[in-house]
């Protein structure tokens, strides 16, 4: 069921169907016999009771006051009264922009980050049964979409998606054609949440090893979903059958970033693996960060300052 009209101040555009629904609707059904009244006051007029005889454009239902359509002179305060329950709304009806498919003052603004999910669905649950067709316009140009009942855009946002999207519902009531327009101003912005990826730990690591043994070099980074992490080392080691890059492990952090870990496994360490730079790199569209590992024979470890030594 359509939710009630809880906002006390409402702005609508002239010429469109409009309704007010009070917020004690379920209660009103229980007390069918209770007198329920709608009033309007504007300027000099104080609390004029509304009924279908007041205007051919007004319709009253259990919980709803409908306008077919709303016009400029409907501006004013509206009251619903039932027993000791009262609800009040201030209605401001503004002029339609005759030179555009939408009225600037009746636009909902949305900011969408580039590459993030972007959706526009043309729905109107209250008038749903009366709607013949619905069209979606971008900057007042009709978009050709498959579904003409509920046109929808679902995609990853691109900068070209920026613009004014207007859902126009066409409906019939008492032999007359009406339309209801809902417009969104979509602004596409750069991904604001991207971090500068960073490799964890010291930039240079000396690892003490023994010939013939194995070693695992673990590289960890904090990065974005789009970023990549990999090992880089000398071309001469490129086809070394003893060097293995293990599968990457990633865990999402509570902030929506990623913690990645990539292990380089060197088996049966030989002389050719010593004193060579094994670089771990994290790359993004904003740059790269690299940390280096150097394998050093345990016997030679006395020559290395303690602060750069990794066991």
């Amino acid at each position: 069921a359509e939710s009630c009209t809880s906002r006390p101040h409402i702005t609508v555009v002239e010429g469109e169907p409009f309704y007010l629904k009070h917020c004690s609707c379920s209660l009103a059904h229980e007390i069918e016999t209770t007198t329920k009244s709608w009033y309007k006051s504007s300027g000099s007029q104080e609390h004029v009771e509304l009924n279908p005889r007041s205007s051919s454009r007004i319709a009253l239902h259990d919980c709803v006051l409908e306008f077919w359509p709303v016009e400029l002179n409907d501006t004013g305060s509206y009251f619903f009264q039932m027993k000791n329950y009262t609800q009040k709304w201030k209605l401001n009806v503004i002029r339609r922009n005759k030179h555009s498919c939408f009225t600037e003052r009746q636009v909902t603004s949305k900011i969408v980050e580039v590459k993030k999910f972007f959706q526009i669905t043309c729905e109107n649950s209250y008038y749903q049964t009366l709607v013949n067709s619905t069209s979606l316009y971008k900057n007042c140009k009709k978009l050709l979409l498959e579904n003409n009942k509920n046109p929808t855009i679902k995609k990853n946002a691109e900068f070209e998606d920026q613009g004014y999207y207007s859902c126009v519902h066409f409906l019939h009531h008492n032999g007359k054609l009406f339309n209801i327009t809902k417009t969104f101003n979509i602004t596409i912005v750069e991904d604001r949440s991207n971090i500068v990826p960073v490799l964890l730990g010291p930039k240079l690591n000396h690892v003490a090893v023994e010939l013939g043994k194995n070693v695992r070099l673990n590289c960890s980074a904090l990065l974005n979903e789009e970023d990549v992490i990999y090992w880089m080392f000398g071309e001469e080691n490129g086809s070394d059958p003893n060097i293995h890059e293990e599968k990457e492990m990633r865990i999402m952090t509570p902030e929506g970033k990623w913690h990645a870990s990539k292990v380089l496994r060197i088996e049966n360490i030989g002389e050719s693996n010593l004193n060579v730079l094994y670089n771990c790199t994290v790359a993004s569209t904003g740059g790269t960060d690299t940390k280096s590992f150097i394998l050093v024979r345990k016997a030679d470890m006395a020559d290395i300052p303690g602060h750069v030594f990794t066991r």
Partner: nanobody
Framework: DVPLQESGGGLVQTGGSLRLSCAAS????????MGWYQQAPGKKYRELVA????????RYIDSVKGRFTISRDNAKNTVYLQMNSLKPEDTAVYYC?????????WGQGTQVTVSS
């Protein structure tokens, strides 16, 4: 203009072959090492599976060694990935990008599906 456009993916049976291509534009292609990256189903990140240096030296991750071959044609600004003896675990979206340097914007990728 999209700087990287991948193509050549498709549906293939286990043991089959595919050749992926990646056309690059907007940067001096021959100066950069290039890589093919794999995004496996359900994974939200891409992992390097093969790369080729500007001089032509290549390297592969263990799981594709001996089955995949990366090559490049600097005259055409294109990098290729020849995939042989395909396995169901090779099913993924494959992307190309630079390697060892600031990444270019990712292309749309090309889907490779290996059925058993």
């Amino acid at each position: 203009d999209v700087p990287l456009q991948e193509s050549g993916g498709g549906l293939v049976q286990t043991g089959g072959s595919l050749r992926l291509s990646c056309a690059a534009s907007g940067f001096t292609f021959n100066s950069y090492a290039m890589g093919w990256y794999q995004q496996a189903p359900g994974k939200k990140y891409r992992e390097l599976v093969a790369h080729i240096g500007s001089g032509g030296s290549t390297r592969y991750i263990d799981s594709v060694k001996g089955r995949f071959t990366i090559s490049r044609d600097n005259a055409k600004n294109t990098v290729y990935l020849q995939m042989n003896s395909l396995k169901p675990e090779d099913t993924a979206v494959y992307y190309c990008n630079v390697y060892g340097a600031t990444l270019r914007s990712w292309g749309q990728g090309t889907q490779v599906t290996v059925s058993s």
